[in-house]
Interface confidence: low
């Protein structure tokens, strides 16, 4: 249905004096032109008293007729002032003016809330020429009004560089309440108060709000919009929504879930991403966060060896990125690893424990108590040592590397020997007489060569001179093949 706002033909003529020839209802317009713009509003209203010349913005023509009579002021005629209608209805309203024929090319433009309406609006201008004047009716129609069509509409016409402006026509579109603020999902602490907000607008006003919790109304009496619901606290998840009522009916907001924060679920899928002699890189998949962001995680590591004392090492890390490199571990050892994460409520249970092993490493200390002495009868240097403590071998010993450097006047030569793991003595041939021999020893595993012991020096005299005093040091070492004794 199109609601039409039109001017009454009685008791006033549509185009009152002094121009002869009022427009009859059976007149056919000489010309009907679509306006440069067009539009679709829809509203209902009662016409005010139309027909009287507009007293506001008028143009006084300076041109005179043949008889030199001054022309009367030009003004839009009064029309309906206020149109109220429901959303999706159609509406049509118009403004009219009588213009002396001496003015050519007059156009009427439509404006809404101070902005010209251009583009696809349904505006039509009709011209009804007579002997001295032309009646112009500008119609504006909206086939299905929306809330956005609310506003003040006016017509404008330019004559003689003067602008003529009609009285405003106020369009008020009424419909179901429209939410401007709906409640939002929240994660809350158990038994702790929180607020939900709901706001809706018309027209028509007022808009009243009812709150609904888990399908049951919370408030018996409605509250005027906006409404804030204070919930004293929840012990379990709940769904809230609000109903907005006005004279046109009811609109229901989206339902929002209010979750109760809880401790997280334990992490899952703890896995070993990389393993070295002294570190293990693990990753895990976080469990459900209990509706509260994770803050940090704790990695718990214990030796899997049943003979260990069972103490647990704790490593704390940020929750992200679900990776952690556990350091300072023993080589070639087995560990049980579990992960737990916390949010603001507390710690999760520990993940399922996984078994992980470190690899072999190079020994971390050198052989101990290195002793070197000359066996002149066989022209050999005997070397003795103690193997590093098992804990510090960082793997299975495969042997030792011996470095011996021979220095005499202007000559220096280094030789490397390797010996098997079973002995703790070695014999090397004298390379140069009247020289200093410097010996260092290192332990070797499949993981690599450990540090060399501190150097031990012995002087090798010229033939015939014997020195039975051994040289020794309690320091570590590293070597290459040699004869084992």
């Amino acid at each position: 249905a199109i609601t039409e706002a039109r001017e009454e033909a009685k008791p006033y003529p549509l185009f009152p004096g002094p121009f002869p020839g009022s427009l009859q209802t059976d007149h056919t317009p000489l010309l009907s032109l679509p306006h440069a713009s067009g539009y679709q509003p829809a509203l209902m209203f009662s016409p005010t008293q139309p027909g009287r010349p507009h007293t506001g913005n008028v143009a006084i023509p300076q041109v005179t007729s043949v008889e030199s009579k001054p022309l009367p002021p030009l003004a839009f005629k009064h029309t309906v002032g206020h149109i109220i209608l429901s959303e999706h209805k159609g509406v049509k309203f118009n403004c009219s003016i009588s213009v002396p024929n001496i003015y050519q090319d007059t156009t009427i433009s439509w404006w809404k809330d101070g902005k010209e309406l251009l583009g696809a609006h349904h505006a039509i201008t009709q011209f009804y020429p007579d002997d001295e004047v032309t009646a112009i009716i500008a119609s504006f129609s909206i086939t299905s009004v929306q809330r956005s069509d609310n506003g003040s509409y006016i017509c404008k016409m330019k004559i003689n560089n003067e602008e003529i402006v009609s009285d405003p026509i106020y369009i008020e579109v009424q419909g179901l309440p429209h939410f401007t603020k709906q409640p939002e999902s929240m994660n809350v602490t158990r038994n702790t108060a929180f607020n939900l907000t709901c706001q809706a607008v018309g027209p028509p006003e007022p808009v009243n709000i009812f709150w609904v919790q888990n399908s049951s109304r919370v408030n018996e009496q409605p509250e005027k919009s906006p409404s804030v619901l204070t919930v004293p606290g929840l012990t379990e998840m709940a769904v809230f929504s609000c109903e907005a009522h006005n004279d046109k009916g009811l609109t229901v907001s989206k339902g929002v879930q209010i979750n109760i924060k809880a401790i997280p679920s334990p992490p899952t899928e703890v896995s070993i991403r990389n393993s070295t002699a002294h570190s293990i890189l693990i990753s895990w998949v976080p469990g459900f966060d209990g509706y509260s962001p994770f803050r940090n995680c704790s990695i718990q590591v214990k030796e899997a060896d049943p003979l260990s004392n069972g103490s647990v090492m704790i490593f704390n890390t940020s929750a992200l990125p679900h990776l952690y490199q556990i350091k300072q571990l023993q080589a070639l050892a087995n560990y049980s690893i579990g992960v737990s994460c916390m949010n603001e409520i507390g710690w999760s249970a520990v993940s399922p424990w996984i078994l992980a092993s470190t690899t072999e490493g190079a020994p971390s200390v050198a052989p101990l108590n290195v002793t070197v002495f000359l066996n002149e009868s066989s022209d050999n240097v005997d070397i003795r040592w103690m193997k590093p403590p098992t804990k510090q071998q960082d793997g299975e010993l495969v042997g030792y590397r011996i470095s011996h450097v021979w220095q005499s006047a202007g000559i220096s030569k280094e030789l490397l020997e390797e010996v098997g793991q079973n002995g703790s003595r070695a014999r090397i041939s004298v390379q140069v007489h009247n020289a200093t021999c410097t010996v260092r020893i290192a332990a070797v595993t499949r993981g690599g060569v450990g540090p060399f012991s501190d150097p031990v020096k012995i002087f090798i005299p010229a033939h015939g001179w014997v020195d039975y005093a051994p040289s020794s040091t309690p320091a570590p070492g590293n070597a290459d093949p040699v004869l084992i004794i």
Epitope: N274, S283, V285, S318, A319
Partner: antibody
Framework: QVQLKQSGPGLVQPSQSLSITCTVS????????VHWVRQSPGKGLEWLGV???????DYNEAFISRLSISKDNSKSHVFFKMNSLQAIDTAIYYC????????????WGQGTSVTVSS | QIVLTQSPAIMSASLGERVTMTCTAS???????FHWYQQKPGSSPKLWIY???NLPSGVPARFSGSGSGTSYSLTISSMEAEDAATYYC?????????FGAGTKLELK
């Protein structure tokens, strides 16, 4: 092929909230996490947060109080919401998939340019 | 948080020239979780080098990456016009995840 397509407003009023949807295809949100990163002339690339395949979230501490990331696995949608925006939050906001191996953002959305202004 | 410092901020290179840019971390990072991204104007960042030295499919072999601990670098053996872009380093090792400020590589 793997794609992440973003939709959201270009202009946000100060103190209002920003909502962006990242719609993914070519992979499942039950298998991969999705990160959110923003890029501004003043601060460069900034990591904001992530939603993991399990639905769990991790946020940059600097944004934890006003950031929310959620998803709908069945619709392949990831939802990003940041509250109380100010002019300093003007930036291009990206969603990006977290690869399985390497741990890196291997595919990125086209970005949503957001201006915070009245 | 781990701060990544890239240098230089801007550099230019001629066609065929060897290019190296660096990224220094404020604390040690496992090399498996250090990456480089390439970004061209109007486009999203692309994963360009992952885990310090690996190239995703589609990245030309003239690119390489190296480094460990706190010092990493990206090298282009022979500059080509299509390599002009901004390159960002990134650590995925500790929260919050962080990026470098970028090195803008221009064609001379």
């Amino acid at each position: 092929q793997v794609q992440l397509k973003q939709s959201g407003p270009g202009l946000v009023q100060p103190s209002q909230s920003l909502s962006i949807t990242c719609t993914v295809s070519g992979f499942s949100l039950t298998d991969y996490g999705v990160h959110w990163v923003r890029q501004s002339p003043g601060k460069g690339l900034e990591w904001l947060g992530v939603i993991w395949s399990s639905g769990t979230t991790d946020y940059n501490e600097a944004f934890i109080s006003r950031l929310s990331i959620s998803k709908d696995n069945s619709k392949s949608h990831v939802f990003f919401k940041m509250n109380s925006l100010q002019a300093i939050d003007t930036a291009i906001y990206y969603c990006a998939r977290k690869g399985h191996d390497p741990y890196a953002m291997d595919y990125w959305g086209q970005g949503t340019s957001v201006t915070v202004s009245s | 948080q781990i701060v990544l410092t890239q240098s230089p901020a801007i550099m230019s290179a001629s066609l065929g020239e060897r290019v190296t840019m660096t990224c220094t971390a404020s604390s040690s990072i496992s090399s498996s979780y250090f990456h480089w991204y390439q970004q061209k104007p109007g486009s999203s960042p692309k994963l360009w080098i992952y885990s310090t030295s690996n190239l995703p499919s589609g990245v030309p072999a003239r690119f390489s990456g190296s480094g460990s601990g706190t010092s990493y670098s990206l090298t282009i053996s022979s500059m080509e016009a299509e390599d002009a872009a901004t390159y960002y380093c990134h650590q995925y090792y500790r929260s919050p995840l962080t990026f470098g400020a970028g090195t803008k590589l221009e064609l001379k």
